[in-house]
């Protein structure tokens, strides 16, 4: 008889995770008595996969009877695979022997490719909110992919952005991928309503790719500007001093008013309009006893903005000469008026 | 159903031959390994000879040059002819098969009883 | 040849007990060892091969292990069905040599 031959038919199969692997042998031969066993690798450090002699491999079934004696096909299917079960398995055929079975001959292998899904893609912005006109960067990962190959882009609102930098890990042959991108993108005042978007394609994804999103709101911070005016008031002894806070981002805003540099009042921002760009008006009004002040008054709106250094605004309120005259007469008195809200600059 | 078979033993001389036969039915015996085993009377099991799938043959030393396993495909029956018969080879002697990728016995014959007595 | 020595020869039981035979081989046999069971007048029954591996229709009572040139056979509780000579065989080399059997009786 001719000797033994051990096929293997298939150089290379691809498999998605969570499938099964049907993995292909037959021998020419029964020829000389001894078992067959499957390993993945060659050499020393060889695994085990599956031997018809013994053992327990409860992933492991034979897609052929072996115990059927004009049974030559020893092709075996592996159960539930992951990225780890990739590699190259060999068909062994052993001739009985002691100590040990002795190896007669192996096929030449079937290299297993498992095509794994990225993980969803998960994006992440910068630690400390920055301004409009300046750069932040945001950072995208996905895990667990293979094969290596995947594209990966950008958008900002729809429009695909080019200042990134992608990298994919290992650089080696790996059972699996990962993958880490890095975008700068420029903020502009109104992107507190706009969004990143990290768009991932890969083979196992058939076409319909996988996405990660950031709000730029949790990124930017939009200073505001501060307007201080007096309204006018029936009454002449009154004055009505308003500060208008405009267009900023995020809500969290404390306003103090200071009268010749004293504190007069702080009041934390509330009620608020939103405007449509999705930054925030307020406006805080002061009423000014003017009969308590002798001399010009000086009006004072501070204003700190998300716990960043204050900014302020001050009206020059002038007291006319015949209230100066009067002045003395009268007790010093500033009534502090409630808040009121001015109508939203869409 | 799968079975083998033996006849052919019998009471014969010493010097004498015989030829034991072992029909097998539910298989294909040339697909398998086969065996003689034997045992004399409140003795244990004795190996005496085999054949492969390639036609190989394999005999105990004491049996070596005087017996002869063979087979007949067509018929689907194993034999052994034994010559030069001796007192020491009274037995039962038993057909079996081996199994299929270790050789290990499964399938037992009945047995067929050879007597060697003057 | 490789000599196999089955130990005790004889071996005293009752119903319901756990008894274990043990079967040594004068050199390695790997894992290449088979155990028959044999009642009086009738043909041996194969009960095990590849020293654990148990023959299609035996019952699990029926358990073996070891390798090398240690070996034992163990059946975990007798039934009276279960009264016969047990033999271990070797069969990794021609010719292949069996144990000269251990006779289990009834207490």
């Known amino acids: 008889e001719d000797e033994l031959q051990v096929i293997q038919p298939e150089k290379s199969v691809s498999v998605a995770a969570g499938e099964s692997a049907t993995l292909r042998c037959a021998m020419t031969s029964l020829i000389p008595v001894g078992p067959i066993m499957w390993f993945r690798g060659a050499g020393a450090g060889r695994e085990l996969i599956y031997n018809q002699k013994e053992g327990h491999f409860p992933r492991v079934t034979t897609v052929s009877e072996l115990t059927k004696r004009n049974n030559l096909d020893f092709s075996i299917s592996i159960s539930n695979i992951t990225p780890a079960d990739a590699g190259t398995y060999y068909c062994v055929k052993f001739r009985k022997g002691s100590p040990d079975d002795v190896e007669f001959k192996s096929g030449a292998g079937t290299e297993l490719s498992v095509r794994a899904k990225p993980s969803a893609p998960v994006v992440s912005g910068p630690a400390v909110r920055a301004t409009p006109e300046h750069t932040v960067s945001f950072t995208c990962e996905s895990h667990g992919f293979s094969p290596r190959d995947i594209t990966l882009k950008w958008f900002k609102n729809g429009n695909e952005l080019s200042d990134f930098q992608t990298n994919v890990d290992p650089a080696g042959d790996s059972v699996s991928y990962s993958i880490h991108s890095t975008a700068r993108v420029v903020l502009t005042r109104g992107d507190v309503h706009s969004q990143v978007i990290c768009e991932i394609a890969h083979i196992t994804l058939q076409g319909d790719p996988l996405r990660g999103t950031a709000n730029l709101s949790e990124a930017i911070r939009v200073p505001p500007t501060l307007e201080v005016t007096q309204q006018p008031m029936r009454a002449e002894n009154q004055a009505n001093v308003t500060c208008q806070v405009s267009n900023f981002y995020p809500r969290g805003l404390q306003l103090t008013w200071l009268e010749n540099g004293n504190v007069s009042r702080t009041e934390t921002a509330s009620t608020l309009i939103e405007n449509k760009d999705g930054t925030y008006n307020w406006m805080s009004w002061l009423l000014v006893n003017t009969c308590a002040h002798r001399d010009d008054v000086v009006l004072t709106c501070q204003v700190e903005h998300d716990g960043q250094q204050a900014v302020s605004k001050s009206y020059a309120l002038e007291i006319s000469a015949h209230q100066k005259e009067h002045g003395s007469d009268i007790t010093h008195e500033a009534a502090l008026a409630p808040t009121a809200p001015l109508g939203g600059s869409g | 159903e799968v079975q083998l078979v033996e006849s052919g033993g019998g009471l014969v001389q010493p010097g004498g031959s015989l030829r034991l036969s072992c029909a097998a039915s539910?298989?294909?015996?040339?697909?398998?390994?086969m065996h003689w085993v034997r045992q004399a009377t409140g003795k244990g099991l004795e190996w005496v000879s085999a054949?492969?799938?390639?036609?190989?043959?394999y005999y105990t030393g004491s049996v070596k040059g005087r017996f002869t396993i063979s087979r007949e495909n067509a018929k689907n029956s194993l034999y052994l002819q034994m010559n030069s018969l001796r007192a020491s080879d009274t037995a039962v002697y038993y057909c079996v098969r081996g199994g299929v990728w270790d050789d290990a016995f499964d399938i037992w014959g009945q047995g067929t009883m050879v007597t060697v007595s003057s | 040849d490789i000599q196999m020595t089955q130990s005790p020869s004889s071996l005293s039981a009752s119903v319901g007990d756990r008894v274990t035979i043990t079967c040594r081989a004068s050199?390695?046999?790997?894992?290449?060892l088979a155990w028959f069971q044999q009642k009086p007048g009738k043909a041996p029954k194969s009960l095990i091969y590849?020293?654990?591996s148990l023959h299609s229709g035996v019952p699990s009572k029926f358990s073996g292990s070891g390798s090398g040139t240690d070996f034992t056979l163990t059946i975990s509780s007798l039934q009276p069905e279960d009264f016969a000579t047990y033999y271990c065989?070797?069969?990794?080399?021609?010719?292949?040599?069996f144990g000269q059997g251990t006779k289990l009786e009834i207490k």
């Open positions: 590849t020293a654990s």
């Open positions: 539910g298989f294909t015996l040339s697909s398998y390994d």
């Open positions: 054949i492969g799938t390639a036609g190989d043959t």
């Open positions: 065989q070797q069969y990794v080399s021609y010719p292949y040599t």
């Open positions: 050199q390695d046999i790997n894992n290449y």
